[in-house]
């Protein structure tokens, strides 16, 4: 019994003066509470709880279920209480068989016994199977087994509470343990898409999926810089016991251009938190924009090849491509391709082959492309570069030696004597006339140039050479002149290509 | 005290079947689990399977699956244990186990042997 | 497939003291468990939970784990304590028993 100061308020006086009373079911309990500023009994097992206003608490006929802790409260608030124990051999167990433990944690299977003197009193797999090696708990008669730091692997355990009387083992009824896991880690956000590009009217939905132990991880859709609270859907599944996602759709039934921003999935737990962020572009109509992957103005060598390439951006997506030239279709020699699988991808590729050019085959080559709501279309100016071709070398009869020469680039033509014999003709002569002709073929063919020189400048027999060149080679004529007195015999022409 | 005993000697041909039984005594039958457990001869012990006497669920090892049946008959405490179209390797002797602590007890063994 | 590995014989001579050994992969996280076969065919578990020792079994019999090895010792031996003896534990989410191969005692 408590110590009593003098002038000090005491704690009440409870008979029998004992802390633990044991009794036999069907006995009397009779507890008596002596304190001049009684106010109340109150008796708590599990989560019952009665009180009484009479200073002496008399149950006639006890029963297992009057086990419990009974305590006398007065005016002061200050308070004793005495553990009754009601043994009745058929109920050796009371019991609440909710059991729920956090991860990590202690909890508290409750079967507090109604006799305190059974022995090993303990926890026991049900069927007899083992519990789990790294399970430790306490017991405690009065309150239950304590689970101590429940871990993940217990979820689902089943379990009794289990005393020997009389050398034999008596369970109590079966407990499974529930877990309620702790967040370790923060959650797993995604996102369905990582960018959209819509027109006005259109319908913009995207899905972000969350994923943790537990259904208590809290998630919104949140825009970027502004506070206003969207509208969202849920879908959620367990995928076993710490497996948990949920979906959350974000719908807008008919973006408009003001719509457009970044959108961010927020999710967070008692560990932390984790976002994801889509982009969403409105435009009020389609588009396409081409890119050329090399000079719009293409320079190449007869007989070689070339590849005109284009990148271009459509959204909606391209409908018809198509390549012209001369206003012919390319029905093959072309391919056209997505630049990438991503399902976001707006850019795409074009690729025209061109093989083995030919001098007539320089001009304007065209790629167009349309969608639903816009055309477009890039041309590249291709010139076939050709080494000079000499057309025509002739005396007039003027006098004049005449040397027409086509090829692209534009062909220079240099004149040159040779005396007498002499294989090299290194003196130079400066044409009389230099003209360029408008070419009767398309434009970007060969450019012709024609040069002429006096003959009668020319006072000894020789070879006079005409040497038309440019970038890509050159080309020689030669006329051979001989003297009879002072007569010029004839003059002969004849080519000899350089390579 | 807990006891578990099990059914006589059986001699079979090949293809017939066999039942045989494991009675529970000075326990709650529905308390604890009854295992089954095969020794062939010159063997070691291979457990086989056991069965929930709360609800009657059996839980097998892979090669017990198929030919063998285990059931209860809670009210008399029994558990049984059928095989089917036995073979000459079904030769052995199958013990029953139960208890506290899964096989806290064991019954004597039944011995099966199968020859034509 | 998981095993539990014991040795297939061991010999004590009259009154020392001899340990059996049981390896399993999953033993640093499952119990053990010890059982005692005699010539008979009778079984009896002397070892439960990894060193618990049932009513009725002689003191003289204990058993310890370490990491991945199970251990019965067993101090005195007896005549009476040849026998073969078999450790049991459980593997997998599902903690199906599963037995080792047994030890063959001879008391010398």
């Known amino acids: 019994q408590p110590s009593v100061s003098p002038g000090e308020p005491s704690p009440p006086s409870i008979h029998p003066g004992k802390s633990d009373l044991i009794v036999r079911v069907g006995d009397e309990i009779r507890l008596l509470c002596t304190d001049p500023g009684f106010v109340k009994w109150t008796f708590e097992i599990l989560d019952e709880t009665n009180e009484n206003k009479q200073n002496e608490w008399i149950t006639e006929k006890a029963e297992a279920t009057n086990t419990g802790k009974y305590t006398c409260t007065n005016k002061h608030g200050l308070s004793n209480s005495i553990y009754v124990f009601v043994r009745d051999p058929a109920k050796l167990f009371l019991v609440d068989r909710s059991l729920y433990g956090k991860e990590d944690n202690d909890t508290l299977v409750r079967c507090p016994l109604t006799d305190p003197e059974v022995t090993n009193y303990s926890l026991k797999g049900c069927q007899g199977k083992p519990l789990p090696k790294d399970l430790r708990f306490i017991p405690d008669p009065k309150a239950g087994i304590m689970i101590k730091s429940v871990k993940r692997a217990y979820h689902r355990l089943c379990l009794h509470c289990s005393v020997d009387q009389e050398g034999k083992s008596v369970l109590s009824e079966k407990f499974i343990l529930k877990v309620r896991p702790a967040f370790k880690a923060v959650p797993v956000v995604s996102v369905s898409k990582a960018s959209y590009l819509l027109r006005e009217g259109e319908e913009f939905t995207v899905t972000c999926t969350i994923k943790d132990v537990s259904s208590s991880v809290y998630s919104t859709w949140k825009r970027e810089n502004s506070q206003t609270k969207l509208q969202e859907k849920y879908n959620s599944w367990h995928h076993g016991d710490f497996n948990y996602e949920r979906q959350a759709t974000l719908t807008i039934s008919s973006a408009r251009v003001n719509d457009s921003g970044v959108f961010m999935c927020y999710a967070n737990n008692t560990f932390g938190s984790a976002n994801v962020t889509t982009t969403l572009e409105v435009v009020d109509k389609g588009f396409i924009n081409i890119f050329p992957m090399i000079n719009t103005t293409v320079f190449v060598n007869d007989g070689e090849n070339v590849d005109l390439i284009v990148e271009y951006e459509a959204f909606p997506k391209p409908e018809h491509q198509q390549w012209i030239y001369m206003n012919r279709t390319f029905t093959d020699k072309w391919e056209d391709y997505p630049k990438s699988e991503n399902e976001s991808n707006i850019r795409y590729v074009s690729e025209l082959h061109l093989t083995r050019l030919k001098g007539t085959e320089g001009g304007t080559y065209t790629f167009l492309v349309s969608n639903s709501d816009v055309n477009a279309a890039i041309a590249f100016n291709v010139y076939v570069n050709t080494k000079p071709e000499i057309l025509t070398y002739d005396r007039l009869v003027n006098g004049m030696l005449q040397c027409v020469a086509a090829g692209f680039p534009e062909p220079t033509i240099d004149w040159y004597f040779c005396p007498g014999t002499e294989q090299r003709c290194s003196a130079s002569v400066l044409p009389v006339d230099v003209q360029t002709l408008n070419s009767s073929g398309p434009p970007f063919g060969k450019l012709v140039v024609q040069s002429s020189i006096d003959s009668s400048a020319f006072k000894h027999n020789g070879t006079v050479e005409c040497k038309a060149y440019n970038d890509v080679g050159k080309t020689s004529a030669y006329f051979n002149f001989a003297f009879k007195g002072n007569n010029k015999e004839q003059i002969h022409p004849h080519t000899l290509f350089t390579p | 005290q807990i006891q578990l005993v099990q059914s006589g000697p059986e001699l079979k041909k090949p293809g017939e079947s066999v039942k045989i039984s494991c009675k529970a005594s000075g326990y709650t039958f529905t308390d604890y689990a009854i295992h089954w457990v095969k020794q062939a001869p010159g063997q070691g012990l291979r457990w086989m399977a056991w069965i929930n006497t709360e609800t009657g669920k059996p839980t097998y090892a892979d090669d017990f699956k198929g030919r063998f049946v285990f059931s209860l008959e809670a009210s008399a405490s029994t558990a049984h244990l059928q095989i089917s179209n036995l073979k000459n390797e079904d030769t052995a002797t199958f013990f029953c186990?139960?208890?506290?602590?899964?096989?806290?007890?064991w019954g004597q063994g039944t011995l099966v042997t199968v020859s034509s | 497939s998981y095993e539990l590995i014991q040795p297939p014989s061991a010999s004590v001579t009259l009154e020392n003291t001899v340990s059996i050994t049981c390896s399993g992969d999953e033993l640093s996280n499952k119990y053990a468990h010890w059982y005692q076969q005699k010539p008979d065919k009778t079984i009896l578990e002397v070892i439960y939970?990894?060193?618990e020792r049932p009513s009725g079994i002689s003191d003289r019999f204990s058993g310890s784990s370490s990491g991945t090895t199970a251990i019965l010792t067993i101090r005195d031996a007896q005549a009476e304590d040849e026998a073969d003896y078999y450790c049991l534990s459980t593997f997998s989410d599902d903690d199906l028993p599963i037995f080792g191969g047994g030890t063959k005692l001879t008391v010398l």
């Open positions: 186990a139960g208890g506290s602590h899964w096989f806290a007890y």
């Open positions: 939970n990894d060193s």
